[in-house]
Amino acid sequence: MMTGTIETTGNISAEKGGSIILQCHLSSTTAQVTQVNWEQQDQLLAICNADLGWHISPSFKDRVAPGPGLGLTLQSLTVNDTGEYFCIYHTYPDGTYTGRIFLEVLESSVAEHGARFQIP
């Protein structure tokens, strides 16, 4: 039975040209996390596999950095980065858990400077 829950940063905003950390956290389960996929819409951004390490999609190699932890750092943000991001946690023995984050990339003067997980 799947007892875990995914906690995410929820709706976040960041400044154009800046960086943001996408972070999910799996709680309320003792299941072992064996892989985490990060996606935007239908595009695979990155995978962190317990045995194989990190893989960053070539399309995002210049702007995506692994971590911290199982999170993902997006750099050099543009307004086109606005949208939904998904973390897909592969676990044993529970199965798959999914979390959703909505990122809004704003012009510099509009973004909230205190947004959680935001990198100055």
């Epitope: 892989q35 996929n37 996606e39 819409q41 239908d42 595009q43 695979l44 995978i47 596999n49 194989l52 893989h55 999609s57 399309s59 998904f86 897909i88 592969h90 798959t96 999914t98």
Partner: antibody, heavy 118, light 107 residues
């Protein structure tokens, strides 16, 4: 449990437009996921055609992009496929399917055979 | 587009046999591969996702492995209900593409 059911004409004339509908039960297509069309010519492999997401975003296979349109009717919890200018090569079993995050397909309709012939 | 090349295209085996099907991607897809089983007149059924993760309810005799460009699907001990056609699919980038299929027949 989500269930998908395709419906539409089984015979379409060459150069006409193929139109199919997928009715989804057990889940609202506006709640989550992407809702896809995948086809399989007789005795051949599978070809992903495109999807409409829960938010209404569409994406199509570039090999079909100029001919394919996927739309939805949220009031009926249905999504539809239109494929224009069909030829005999479009004869296939057409499936609707739900895409899960990670881009695999755990739920499929039973499929409907569409024959293109005059 | 990423091409998925499956081999063999057909295979004859007996109940109890161990069977292996391979799938080669035309570029690195890391672990983004799924495997499906299709019986005549039926829709494909998802067995394995992310190269090695079994769907809930799928018997443990079905397994998948591999990363990068080379992937393997194994049935450890064939059962009568396993005779079907099997497809790999890359879930790495659109357009999502499938292998041409491997037909598993009774010897």
């Amino acid at each position: 449990q989500v269930q998908l059911q395709e419906s539409g004409p089984g015979l379409v004339k060459p150069s006409q437009t193929l139109s199919l509908t997928c009715t989804v039960s057990g889940y609202s297509i506006t709640d989550d996921y992407a809702w896809n069309w995948i086809r399989q010519p007789p005795g051949k492999g599978l070809e992903w055609m495109g999807y409409i997401s829960y938010s209404g975003h569409t994406r199509y296979n570039p090999s079909l992009k100029s001919r394919v349109t996927i739309s939805r009717d949220t009031s009926k919890n249905q999504f539809s496929l239109k494929l224009s200018s069909v030829t005999a090569a479009d004869t296939a079993v057409y499936y609707c399917a739900r895409k899960y995050y990670g881009s695999w397909f755990p739920d499929w309709g039973q499929g409907t055979l569409v024959t293109v012939s005059s | 587009d990423i091409q998925m090349t499956q081999s063999p295209s057909s295979l004859s085996a007996s109940v109890g046999d161990r069977v292996t099907i391979t799938c080669k991607a035309s570029q690195d897809v890391f672990t983004a591969v799924a495997w499906y089983q299709q019986k005549p007149g039926k829709a494909p059924k998802l067995l394995i996702y992310s190269a090695s993760y079994r769907m809930t309810g799928v018997p443990s005799r079905f397994s998948g492995s591999g990363s990068g460009t080379d992937f393997t699907f194994t049935i450890s001990s064939l059962q009568p209900e396993d005779f079907a056609t099997y497809y790999c699919q890359q879930s790495y980038s659109t357009p999502w593409t499938f292998g041409q299929g491997t037909r598993l027949e009774i010897k």
